[in-house]
Interface confidence: medium
């Protein structure tokens, strides 16, 4: 046993453009309120029910009134820890929902109106007794910081809170085969209690409350031995006796989900999925009502009509499963274009587009050279979201606003000088060769490697490089 | 008494590398952060980074990002801070600190008594 | 990163006296600020978390206020013992940061 704690240290406009609107008014001040799922294991989508951890709701925060015309500020927070007391193991990996409310307060005609202002949800592995385990996160343009941990109530200790530690019985040492309990160095660990009635010779738990059976021995006591005759062994270890395996307890052996709830082990355990109605991590509560505010994320709760149902959520749009746990991954149907990216704020999808391409989903290619223009002759090349000019001889750089220098290449073949030249560059050949880059060698008996030198041109001259 | 008990002072070459330990008693090591900040001499303080004893992780300012590591062993409630690739701009007074028992809020409550690192040819 | 600006740097006063010391943070932090002081040749110690919690321990003649982006340290009646160097530092977000410190000195 033990009990997840969470302080939450601010919740107010997140980083960037666009802060939100204030959610209180001086015509309707508000307060604020929290309210934390927890379920065990690191799916979102393993349990129906949502809170089978448990859940817990904070007091009311002070009363808020914007000030007209200032920026939503960080909102007044309620004092104290939301503590979720946890009866069994601590799972070591967990899935928390933590939901903003605004209590409105009006002239409400029927009391105060609640509205659900943002809700976040993560995934988290977490062992008990680690220190606090700081967190932000942001749901559209709100951020909420805030920071958690698991601690045991004693006498339990260790990551999972499943170790149970007693005062020493003797100053100096422990019982037989119970170590000190660290750090409590004057603590022992104390002997768990297991299933009343497990055999003490062939039974052994390794958390209170449980039987498990010592090779050769089954049922819920291990009392029974195992038939060596036939070998069922789905699982457990190897028998030296028989040469077969001898069927161990699996966590879900006996289902323990009560209510009609299906069991799925888990690495470490097992996980109980409940009909609508029950919940807990053996689906062992039950009678949850509409007054018990099942529905999550702004879901409408309705007395359910048949006696199974003692609810019914309609969630809103964006949400689904039983208790409107579940978020709708609408980004998975990749609604935005062009390789945009989607954003799903709740309310409404966003995509964010590439540079060029604009529209609600990213649909419309601009025109890149749209007002674009190249200076000094150059030609605008549109192509994959961005402009690209292409230069007229001797410029460069994005808008082919600087100048080039030809010579910098060093062009020239062959020691050729080199001599920039208003249209472009020109080589200066060293004697013995020829053409417009000095790359041909002149012939020693006069004739080039070139079919004739235009007229007026002798072998030698500078050649301009067009 | 909660307390954080650092190794001693420190000389070494540029180049070389440094390891600081910082030995917890007095509460559970697994329960708080621990940090490390440094201190030049006659300069301001310098946070460098820290380490979840209970899982090993770490974060560290991305100043030291390759150059140092952060350790622990649960075993000895000690911590570790290992800086390479040392310069004489490192030299300076190495601080362990323990986090404030505050939910996360990153306050230094329990400071080590520092160790003098000196880096010189 | 958040850079974290304290003034004066150092001041000069006399026993009795009120004294203020600010920090201003490059951007909001809400209220993770928490105030250090420092003796020569010891580590620091912290008086002051979340902007305005007194640390247990810690007499109340020292008291932090401010939100948002500027925040102040007061001594409300010096004392021979509070001749230090007075730091800030933020929390809101790695990597943690410091200001560069005020020496109160005696005049």
């Known amino acids: 046993a033990g009990v997840f704690e969470l302080q939450i240290h601010s919740f107010g406009p997140g980083p960037g453009p666009g802060a939100p609107r204030s959610p209180c008014s001086a015509r309707l001040p508000c307060r604020l309120f929290f309210r934390v799922c927890l379920k065990p294991g690191l799916s979102e989508e393993a349990a129906e029910s949502p809170c089978a951890l448990g859940a817990a709701l904070s007091a009311r925060g002070p009363v808020y009134t914007e000030q007209p015309g200032a920026p939503a500020p960080d909102l007044p927070l309620p004092d104290g820890l939301l503590q979720v007391p946890f009866r069994d193991a601590w799972p070591g990996t967990f899935s928390f929902i933590i939901e903003t409310w605004r209590e409105e307060l009006g002239d409400q005609i029927g009391g105060p109106a609640w509205s659900l202002l943002a809700r976040v949800a993560g995934r988290r592995r977490l062992a008990a007794g680690g220190p606090w385990a700081r967190d932000i996160q942001r749901a559209g343009a709100w951020e909420l910081r805030f920071s958690y941990r698991a601690r045991c109530e004693p006498p339990a200790v260790g990551t999972a809170c499943t170790r149970l530690c007693r005062p020493r019985s003797a100053p100096s040492r422990c019982g037989p085969g119970l170590r000190p309990c660290a750090p409590l160095e004057d603590e022992c660990e104390a002997p768990l209690v297991c299933r009343a009635g497990c055999s003490p010779e062939h039974g052994f738990c390794e958390q209170p409350g449980e039987c498990r059976c010592l090779e050769g021995w089954t049922g819920p006591l291990c009392t029974v031995p195992v038939s060596t005759s036939s070998c069922l062994s789905p699982r457990g270890p190897s028998s030296a006796t028989t040469g077969c395996l001898v069927p161990g307890p699996g966590p879900c052996d006996g289902n323990p989900c009560a209510n009609g709830g299906s069991c799925s082990e888990t690495p470490r355990s097992f996980e109980c999925t409940c009909p609508r109605g029950f919940y807990g991590l053996r689906c062992e509560v039950s009678g949850v009502t509409c007054a018990d505010g099942p529905c999550f994320n702004g879901g409408l709760c309705v007395g359910g009509a048949d006696p199974d149902s003692a609810y019914i959520c309609h969630c809103p749009p964006g949400f689904q499963g039983s208790n409107c746990e579940k978020r709708v991954d609408r980004c998975s149907l990749q609604p935005c274009r062009n390789g945009g990216l989607c954003l799903d704020l709740g309310h409404a999808l966003r995509c964010r587009c590439r540079a060029g391409f604009a529209g609600p989903r990213c649909e419309h290619d601009l025109d890149d050279c749209a007002g674009r223009a190249c200076a000094n002759g150059g030609t605008c090349v549109e192509g994959g979201g961005a402009h690209r000019c292409s230069c007229a001889l001797g410029f460069g750089g994005r808008d082919c606003r600087e100048r080039a220098d030809p010579c910098a290449a060093r062009p020239c073949a062959h020691g050729g000088r080199c001599y920039a030249h208003f249209s472009g560059l020109v080589c200066a050949c060293a004697p013995g060769y020829m053409g417009a880059r000095c790359e041909f060698p002149v012939h020693p008996d006069g004739a080039s490697a070139l079919p004739a030198a235009p007229p007026g041109l002798r072998p030698g001259d500078p050649q301009r490089y067009l | 008494q909660v307390q954080l008990v650092q190794s001693g002072a420190e000389v070494k070459k540029p180049g070389a590398s440094v390891k600081v330990s910082c030995k917890a008693s007095?509460?559970?090591?697994?329960?708080?952060?621990m940090h490390w900040v440094r201190q030049a001499p006659g300069q301001g303080l310098e946070w460098m980074g820290w380490i979840n004893p209970n899982s090993g992780d770490t974060n560290y300012a991305q100043k030291f990002q390759g150059r140092v590591t952060m350790t622990r062993d649960t075993s000895i409630s000690t911590a570790y801070m290992e800086l390479s690739r040392l310069t004489s701009d490192d030299t300076a007074v190495y601080y362990c600190?323990?986090?404030?028992?505050?939910?996360?809020?990153?306050?230094?409550?329990?400071w080590g008594q520092g160790t003098m690192v000196t880096v010189s040819s | 990163d958040i850079q974290m600006t304290q003034s004066p740097s150092s001041l000069s006063a006399s026993v009795g006296d009120r004294v203020t010391i600010t920090c201003r943070a490059s951007?909001?932090?809400?209220?993770?600020l928490n105030w250090y002081q420092q003796k020569p040749g010891k580590a620091p110690k912290l008086l002051i978390y979340?902007?305005?919690s007194l640390q247990s321990g810690v007499p109340s003649r020292f008291s932090g206020s401010g939100s948002g982006t500027d925040f102040t340290l007061t001594i409300s009646s010096l004392q021979p013992e509070d001749f230090a160097t007075y730091y800030c530092?933020?929390?809101?977000?790695?990597?943690?940061?410091f200001g560069g410190g005020t020496k109160v000195e005696i005049k």
């Open positions: 007095g509460y559970t090591f697994t329960g708080y952060y």
């Open positions: 979340a902007a305005s």
């Open positions: 600190a323990r986090d404030a028992n505050i939910a996360a809020l990153d306050a230094f409550e329990i």
């Open positions: 530092q933020q929390s809101y977000s790695t990597p943690l940061t």
């Open positions: 951007q909001s932090i809400s209220s993770y």
